[in-house]
C-alpha cells in the first residue's frame, strides 16, 4: 500500500531505536571514512525530520523517497570531495542513479585500522556512562568495515553485545567474562558478514532469479513439510528483503524482515513444526532465530523423485511450457529430500537437470535420453563429498593453525600473483572451516563446508575484482557462483608464474614480534610462509616444513633471549641463509 510519507511509515513501523540504528548503519556503509560524531549528527537530523513527518505527513519534503532524503543529507556534507574523491560526483546525479552511484563506491576493503577492542575496564566504564553512544560506535565501526552487512542482523549483534556488557560489567573479573563472550559474537558476526556479501554478489551479478533459486533450495531443506507454493512465497519474500538490504534500502529491508517473521509465526502449521520457540521472542531475536532454525523432519512417505522428473511422459512439455516453474519444482523436491547437501551442490544438480532437458527435449526420443539423468548426478555429488573427507582428515591431523598453513600453501601456489595479505586472510578464513564444520555430525558436514567455503571464496573474488592480478582467479570468479568452489579446488600450481626474487627484508624480524598477541604472531608467520611459496612455488612440503620449523624456533629462541634485539639482529641473517639453502 502506498503511504504519503515513506519515512514516517518506516519510523512508525520500526520504532525510534531501530530506526536510528538503521540510519546510522546506512550512512556508515555509504560514507565509510566519516567519523562517528559526523554520522550521529546526521542521524539525529534525519530522526527529527522523520518525527515531523509522523506528526504531519503533508509537511514539507515528507513525500520524498528515503533515497532522496538520505542522498541529500550525504551530499550536503562539507568537504565531501576532499575526503571521498569521485564519490562526490554521484551528487550531480538524480535518483535512482545517484543511489546506484553510491552503491558502486562501497569499498569492501576500506583503508581502516583493524577494530581494536578496548581493555575490559575501559570498555565497561564507557558502556555504563553512555550505553547508547557505546552501541552506536559498535554499529558504526562494524558497518563501515562491512558495507554490505545485513542491517537488521547487525542490530541483533548490537543487542547481543549489549547483553554481554550488561552481564559482564558487574563481574569482579570483567575480562574473563567479556573475552570469550565477545569473541563468540565477533566470530558469528564475521561469518554473517561474508555470507551476506555472497548474497549481495549473487544479486548484483546474477539477478533475482539466481538468488530466488538459492532461497528455494535453502527453504526446502529447512521446511521439507511445507508445500511448494509456501516455499515459493517465502523465497520471494526473502529475495525482496535481501534485494532491499543489498541495495541500501535498509529501513524497508528491516521492516519487511519483521513482517516475514510475523507471517511465518502466524502460519507455522503450513511451514514447520520447529518454529514455536522462535516465535515467542522479541522481533530481532525472532527473525534471527528463524534464520538459524534447525531443519524440520523429512516427511516419511516421499515418493522417488524419478516418478515426477524422469518417468513422466510430459517432462518435455512441462520444461517447454513452464520452464522456471518446472525447474523450481525439481529444485524443491530434490532439496527437501537432501538436507545433507550444500545449497551450491543442489543448484549444480538443478543446472545439470536443466542442461539435460535442454539437450534431450530437442532429440527424437527424449525419455530414452533423459532417463539416466539421476545417475549422472553421482560424480557431481561425489566431488564435494571427497573434498569434505580429505580436508576434514587433514584438519584433524594438523589442527586449525596447521590446516590454515596447508591451505595457504595450496592457494599461494594456485594464485601467487594475489597480494600476500589477501592470501593470508583467505587462507585463515578457509582454514577455519575445519573448526566450524569438521566436528559436526556427518550429515551436516557437507552443507557446512561447501557453503562456508563458497562465501569465503566470494570475498576473495570481491577483493580480487578491485585489483585483478591472476587470470586463473578472474576465470573462477567470472563464472557461475555455484561453480566457483569446484573451480578453485581444481586449480593447480600456476606454471606461468615467474617466482619472486628472494628479498632478505621480507624475512627480517625484530623483537616487536615477541609482544604481539598470538593471532598477530600467526599472521606474521603465515605472511612469511606465503612469501616463501612465492619465492619457490614448487617447494616440497618437507622443504617448507623445515624452513617454517626453523623460523618458529628462531622466534621462540630470540623472544626468550635476554637481549632480544641483538638476537634478532645476529640470528636473523643466519636464518635467511639457511632458508635459502634449504629451498635451493
Amino acid at each position: 500500500e502506498a503511504h504519503k510519507s515513506e519515512i514516517a511509515h518506516r519510523f512508525k513501523d520500526l520504532g525510534e531505536q531501530h530506526f536510528k540504528g538503521l540510519v546510522l548503519i546506512a550512512f556508515s556503509q555509504y560514507l565509510q571514512k566519516c567519523p562517528y560524531e559526523e554520522h550521529i549528527k546526521l542521524v539525529q537530523e534525519v530522526t527529527d525530520f522523520a518525527k515531523t513527518c509522523v506528526a504531519d505527513e503533508n509537511a514539507e519534503n515528507c513525500d520524498k523517497s528515503i533515497h532522496t532524503l538520505f542522498g541529500d543529507k550525504l551530499c550536503a556534507i562539507p568537504k565531501l570531495r576532499d575526503n571521498y574523491g569521485e564519490l562526490a560526483d554521484c551528487c550531480a546525479k538524480q535518483e535512482p542513479e545517484r543511489n546506484e552511484c553510491f552503491l558502486q563506491h562501497k569499498d569492501d576493503n576500506p583503508n581502516l585500522p583493524p577494530f581494536q577492542r578496548p581493555e575490559a575496564e575501559a570498555m565497561c566504564t564507557s558502556f555504563q556512562e553512555n550505553p547508547t553512544s557505546f552501541l552506536g560506535h559498535y554499529l558504526h565501526e562494524v558497518a563501515r568495515r562491512h558495507p554490505y552487512f545485513y542491517a537488521p542482523e547487525l542490530l541483533y549483534y548490537a543487542e547481543k553485545y549489549n547483553e554481554v556488557l550488561t552481564q559482564c560489567c558487574t563481574e569482579s573479573d570483567k575480562a574473563a567474562c567479556l573475552t570469550p563472550k565477545l569473541d563468540a559474537v565477533k566470530e558469528k558476526a564475521l561469518v554473517a558478514a561474508v555470507r551476506q556479501r555472497m548474497k549481495c554478489s549473487s544479486m548484483q551479478r546474477f539477478g533475482e532469479r539466481a538468488f530466488k533459486a538459492w532461497a528455494v533450495a535453502r527453504m526446502s531443506q529447512r521446511f521439507p513439510n511445507a508445500e511448494f507454493a509456501e516455499i515459493t512465497k517465502l523465497a520471494t519474500d526473502v529475495t525482496k528483503i535481501n534485494k532491499e538490504c543489498c541495495h541500501g534500502d535498509l529501513l524497508e529491508c528491516a521492516d519487511d524482515r519483521a513482517e516475514l517473521a510475523k507471517y511465518m509465526c502466524e502460519n507455522q502449521a503450513t511451514i514447520s513444526s520447529k518454529l514455536q520457540a522462535c516465535c515467542d521472542k522479541p522481533v530481532l531475536q525472532k527473525s534471527q532465530c528463524l534464520a538459524e532454525i534447525e531443519h524440520d523432519n523429512i516427511p516419511a512417505d516421499l515418493p522417488s523423485i524419478a516418478a515426477d522428473f524422469v518417468e513422466d511422459k510430459e517432462v518435455c512439455k512441462n520444461y517447454a511450457e513452464a520452464k522456471d516453474v518446472f525447474l523450481g519444482t525439481f529444485l524443491y523436491e530434490y532439496s527437501r529430500r537432501h538436507p545433507d547437501y550444500s545449497v551450491s551442490l543442489l543448484l549444480r544438480l538443478a543446472k545439470k537437470y536443466e542442461a539435460t532437458l535442454e539437450k534431450c527435449c530437442a532429440e527424437g526420443d527424449p525419455p530414452a535420453c533423459y532417463g539416466t539423468v539421476l545417475a549422472e548426478f553421482q560424480p557431481l555429488v561425489e566431488e564435494p563429498k571427497n573434498l569434505v573427507k580429505t580436508n576434514c582428515e587433514l584438519y584433524e591431523k594438523l589442527g586449525e593453525y596447521g590446516f590454515q598453513n596447508a591451505v595457504l600453501v595450496r592457494y599461494t601456489q594456485k594464485a601467487p600473483q594475489v597480494s600476500t595479505p589477501t592470501l593470508v586472510e583467505a587462507a585463515r578464513n578457509l582454514g577455519r572451516v575445519g573448526t566450524k564444520c569438521c566436528t559436526l555430525p556427518e550429515a551436516q558436514r557437507l552443507p557446512c563446508v561447501e557453503d562456508y567455503l563458497s562465501a569465503i571464496l566470494n570475498r576473495l573474488c570481491v577483493l580480487h575484482e578491485k585489483t585483478p592480478v591472476s587470470e586463473k582467479v578472474t576465470k573462477c570468479c567470472s563464472g557461475s557462483l555455484v561453480e566457483r568452489r569446484p573451480c578453485f579446488s581444481a586449480l593447480t600450481v600456476d606454471e606461468t608464474y615467474v617466482p619472486k626474487e628472494f628479498k632478505a627484508e621480507t624475512f627480517t624480524f625484530h623483537s616487536d614480534i615477541c609482544t604481539l598477541p598470538d593471532k598477530e604472531k600467526q599472521i606474521k608467520k603465515q605472511t612469511a610462509l606465503a612469501e616463501l611459496v612465492k619465492h619457490k612455488p614448487k617447494a616440497t612440503e618437507d622443504q617448507l616444513k623445515t624452513v617454517m620449523g626453523d623460523f618458529a624456533q628462531f622466534v621462540d629462541k630470540c623472544c626468550k633471549a635476554a637481549d632480544k634485539d641483538n638476537c634478532f639482529a645476529t640470528e636473523g641473517p643466519n636464518l635467511v641463509a639457511r632458508s635459502k639453502e634449504a629451498l635451493a
Epitope: 511448494f228 507454493a229 518417468e311 510430459e314 512439455k317 518446472f326
Partner: nanobody, 126 residues
C-alpha cells in the same frame, strides 16, 4: 486440508456433451495443478486431463484429446471438464484430484495424488 467436490455427472447419449465441475477448498488452490482421473468398472484409475496452477498449461490423455477441454475459474475455486463427442468407452466414475502446492502435473500416477473428491458417475449409453 484440501477438500474437493465433483458434480455434473449423469446419463448421456453417445455423441452428447457433459460439463463436470470440481469445487475446491484449499488455501493455494489457484497455484495448484488439478487433474481429472476416471475409473471404469473393473479397471485401474486413469488420468484424463490436468491443468496447471498459476501457469497456463493443460494436459490430456491421448484418448480424450480434441474432445475434452479442461479449464478453471480461480475466482470460484472451481475446475471444469467439458466433455464433447462422448463415447460409450468414456463411461466411468470421474474424480477430481490434487497434489497440494504443485503448480504442474508432473506425474499421472494416481498414487501420488493425496487428495480426491468422492467422484461423479458418467454413463454414455443409448
Amino acid at each position: 486440508e484440501v477438500q474437493l467436490l465433483e458434480s455434473g455427472g449423469g446419463l448421456v447419449q453417445p455423441g452428447g456433451s457433459l460439463r463436470l465441475s470440481c469445487a475446491a477448498s484449499y488455501r493455494y488452490i489457484d497455484e495448484t495443478a488439478v487433474a481429472w482421473f476416471r475409473q471404469a468398472p473393473g479397471k485401474e484409475r486413469e488420468f484424463v486431463a490436468g491443468i496447471g496452477g498459476g501457469v497456463d498449461i493443460t494436459y490430456y490423455a491421448d484418448s480424450v484429446k480434441g474432445r475434452f477441454t479442461i479449464s478453471r475459474d480461480n475466482s470460484k475455486n472451481t475446475l471444469y471438464l467439458q466433455m464433447n463427442s462422448l463415447r460409450p468407452e468414456d463411461t466411468a466414475v470421474y474424480y477430481c484430484a490434487a497434489r497440494p502446492g504443485r503448480p504442474l502435473i508432473t506425474s499421472k500416477v494416481a498414487d501420488l495424488y493425496p487428495y480426491w473428491g468422492q467422484g461423479t458417475l458418467v454413463t454414455v449409453s443409448s
